[in-house]
Interface confidence: low
């Protein structure tokens, strides 16, 4: 039908920096490039109905549903979502097309559903249907990449069995140590599955999809480097592929490399060699040891020997299940208010862990650093000197680990007081936990030096918000002290703090009566 307008429906994904419910907008915010949603005429429907392709949105993502109408004259419109009407302000772009937008900020379950846009132009009326759902990521998996030798070629293929299909990249570095950090200029990334250049110093393969990024490093023994102080150790689970690269550089080609497992040469088909000349005409040789699917009997010391270099070994340990080894006993720390301090957990784990630090039900990102001895360490320094319980939680495919820390901040007590008809209470959160004294103020003791010992009840309680301890002291009122000012004092090794309370009077003029007597 030539009277029908030309409709274009697009989805615009935004970088999140705002929060609101869905709203109709005439000028959507600046964002990513639009994705065409098709907008095809829906057959067998009463009236003219266009249907956009279904939109799947991540939780908390921000999007704009936008319709571009190429029709003469003015248009008016109305959005309907879950039987509620939302106002609609069309405007015209530079090509004189009508533009109608619906902005959904911070997508939630309640904002999923069908969005209907009714448009009235001078020529005709029509409806546009958008179906918006929250992307269900339960199906998604992100598996650590592993290596395979490419058939009939000296090349490695990187494989990650993940859903959705991940983007695989090789991360290569040719310098030593710290300069091989992700952001370093020495690092080269290649977004491809097959790698032919296998002579580099540091070779990693990473896979990323909506769930994040997982990397596997090509385990390497470099005969030109001094060996680590502790024997390098490689863990694998039964059925996983084993890859170890032995690398050596020599002034000429007159040297060879061999692999042995527990003093027995590796069988043919479990190794392959490559060599090349470097820019300074020295010869680089690499010899790969590989087992496509390891079994328990592949455990042992793998030694790479050279006719021109000292040999080096690595201990390969094959386990049935993954593990996390660390001491899970809880640890308590007390520090001064301005003292620099970090929690740290040292652990050995396979496969690599995912971890979080939690304080007061809030989670913080967790970084891990590999140590030379095969252990890893995770530190948390962002406590902002808040006392309480801190939790380190780590897990991998097969194991979970939780460790509790308590942080106490040494400080002078701060006292809060409250009184009721029958008692007075004081609270303090100083550390070390304070001791209490109660004193009565009267004409005989204007400086409040008369100590009260009867009817006092002290206790410490856990204030659940931060898991920190709060000490309290309660004074039960007796006739002898009603109508008087009393002072509660909390003291610890860092100082004393007091609060004065006027206790309820038994008669109308307590002080005058007291003075007369």
């Amino acid at each position: 039908n030539q009277d029908l307008p030309v409709i274009k429906c697009v989805l615009i994904n935004h970088k999140n920096n705002d929060s609101s419910v869905g709203k109709s907008s005439s000028y959507p915010m600046v964002s990513e490039s639009p994705e065409d949603l098709g907008c095809a005429l829906r057959p067998q429907s009463s009236g003219t109905v266009y249907e956009a392709a279904a939109v799947e949105v991540d939780v908390s993502a921000s999007i704009t549903l936008q319709v571009l109408v190429d029709a003469p004259g003015n248009i008016s419109c109305l959005w309907v979502f879950k039987h509620s009407s939302l106002n609609c302000q069309p405007h015209f772009d530079l090509q004189n097309r009508g533009v109608v937008s619906m902005v959904i900020l911070k997508m939630t379950e309640t904002q999923a559903g069908e969005y209907l846009l009714f448009i009235q132009s001078e020529a005709t009326n029509y409806t546009i249907l958008f179906t918006v759902s929250i992307r269900n990521t339960l199906l998604y998996t992100l598996r650590r990449p592993y290596f395979r030798k490419m058939e009939n070629q000296d090349a490695l293929v990187c494989i990650s069995e993940s859903v959705p299909e991940p983007i695989v990249e090789w991360v290569l570095c040719d310098s030593q140590g710290e300069s091989c950090k992700e952001e370093s200029p020495a690092v080269v990334k290649k977004e491809e599955k097959v790698l032919h250049e296998l002579f580099g110093t540091d070779i990693r393969c990473c896979a990323r999809n909506e769930l994040g990024r997982e990397c596997t490093r090509l385990f390497t023994i470099d005969l030109n480097q001094t060996p680590q102080t502790t024997l390098p150790q490689l863990f694998l689970k039964v059925g996983e592929p084993l890859w170890i690269r032995c690398k050596a550089v020599h002034v000429n080609h007159g040297f060879g490399l061999t692999w042995e497992l527990e003093n027995k040469a590796l069988e043919e088909g479990n190794y392959f060699e490559m060599s090349t000349y470097s820019t300074n005409r020295t010869m680089i040789r690499i010899l790969f040891a590989f087992v496509s699917s390891v079994a328990r009997n592949d455990t042992g010391y793998y030694t790479c020997s050279s006719s021109k270099h000292p040999s080096q070994s690595a201990l390969v340990t094959i386990v049935e299940k993954g593990f996390i080894n660390a001491t899970n006993s809880s640890e308590d720390y007390e520090i001064d208010q301005y003292e620099e301090f970090c929690f740290s957990v040292r652990f050995k784990a396979y496969p690599q862990i995912r971890c979080t630090w939690t304080f007061s039900r809030k989670s913080f990102p967790c970084e891990q650093k590999g140590l030379d001895n095969g252990y890893s360490i995770s530190k948390f320094c962002n406590h902002k000197h808040q006392p309480g319980e801190y939790i380190f939680h780590a897990e991998n495919d097969d194991a979970q680990f939780t460790k509790m820390f308590t942080l106490n901040i040494r400080r002078k007590p701060q006292v809060l007081a409250e009184a009721s008809a029958s008692q007075a209470s004081c609270f303090s959160d100083g550390y070390p936990l304070p001791s209490w004294t109660w004193k009565k103020c009267s004409d005989k003791s204007p400086n409040c030096t008369e100590e009260i010992t009867e009817g006092v009840w002290n206790r410490k309680a856990n204030r659940k918000v931060f898991g920190q301890w709060v000490s309290s002291s309660t004074l039960n009122m007796s006739e002898a002290i009603k109508g008087f000012l009393v002072k509660c004092c909390a003291y610890n090794s860092l100082g004393t703090s007091c609060e004065t309370i006027l206790l309820n009077s038994p008669g109308p003029f307590p002080f005058i009566q007291d003075n007369i007597s």
């Epitope: 279904a54 939109v55 799947e56 759902s133 929250i134 992307r135 269900n136 339960l138 199906l139 998996t141 598996r143 069995e161 993940s162 859903v163 689970k237 039964v238 059925g239 996983e240 699917s293 049935e320 299940k321 495919d397 097969d398």
Partner: antibody
């Protein structure tokens, strides 16, 4: 109770396409993924792919990539599996199965199956 | 893809027998394994999920065990209605893959 009812048997010529439907009832259609699994005569089970009825996203087995299309119609709680460029080795019973649990990996309810015969 | 190998491919047993079927994965799949029963001309039926959890409505004579690469389905006392083909299936990584099946026949 949960039911998956599939369309009837089909006979197709090599090179043609077939579209099998699977109508779900007895549960919230958009809350569970739907798998398609096939079984050649006298053979084992072969996973073909999966569709998210909520948003329509799909994931197909490598073997069927480019030949299979899975779609859904939420208004009728029906999923469809279309297989194109049919060859004789595609003769099989095709099942839809509801996925539950981690990675939607437990196939807890199955359709009765649709026999597709490819023969010249 | 992860390969699933079932053994034996067929076995003959009598009513009341204890029957054991094994399934081996080509790599560790943790506990991500299901067992199904299929009778001729019928769709498969879920018996055990997550290696050892019994699906509701399934008789307690069926049990599953194992983790990593080796798994077992046990029928403690075979009943006449248990003569069927049994399949294991991993869902540790996509695509899900099935074992070749074990046919349990009447001796």
């Amino acid at each position: 109770q949960v039911q998956l009812v599939q369309s009837g048997a089909e006979v197709k010529k090599p090179g043609a396409s077939v579209k099998v439907s699977c109508k779900a009832s007895g549960y919230t259609f958009t809350k569970y993924y739907m798998h398609w699994v096939r079984q050649a005569p006298g053979q084992g089970l072969e996973w073909m792919g999966i569709i998210n009825p909520s948003g329509g996203s799909t994931s197909y087995a490598q073997k069927f990539q480019g030949r299979v299309t899975m779609t859904r119609d939420t208004s009728t709680s029906t999923v469809y599996m279309e297989l194109s460029s049919l060859r004789s080795e595609d003769t099989a019973v095709y099942y839809c199965a509801r996925g539950r649990g981690y990675s939607y990996g437990y196939l807890d309810y199955w359709g009765q199956g649709t026999l597709v015969t490819v023969s010249s | 893809d992860i390969q699933m190998t079932q053994s034996p491919s067929s076995l003959s047993a009598s009513v009341g027998d204890r029957v054991t079927i094994t399934c081996r994965a080509s790599q560790s799949i943790s506990s991500s394994l299901n067992w199904y029963q299929q009778k001729p001309g019928k769709a498969p039926k879920l018996l055990i999920y997550k290696a050892s959890s019994l699906e509701s409505g399934v008789p307690s004579r069926f049990s599953g065990s194992g983790s990593g690469t080796d798994f077992t389905l046990t029928i403690s006392s075979l009943q006449p209605e248990d003569f069927a083909t049994y399949y294991c299936q991993q869902y540790y990584s996509y695509p899900p893959t099935f074992g070749g099946g074990t046919k349990v026949e009447i001796k």
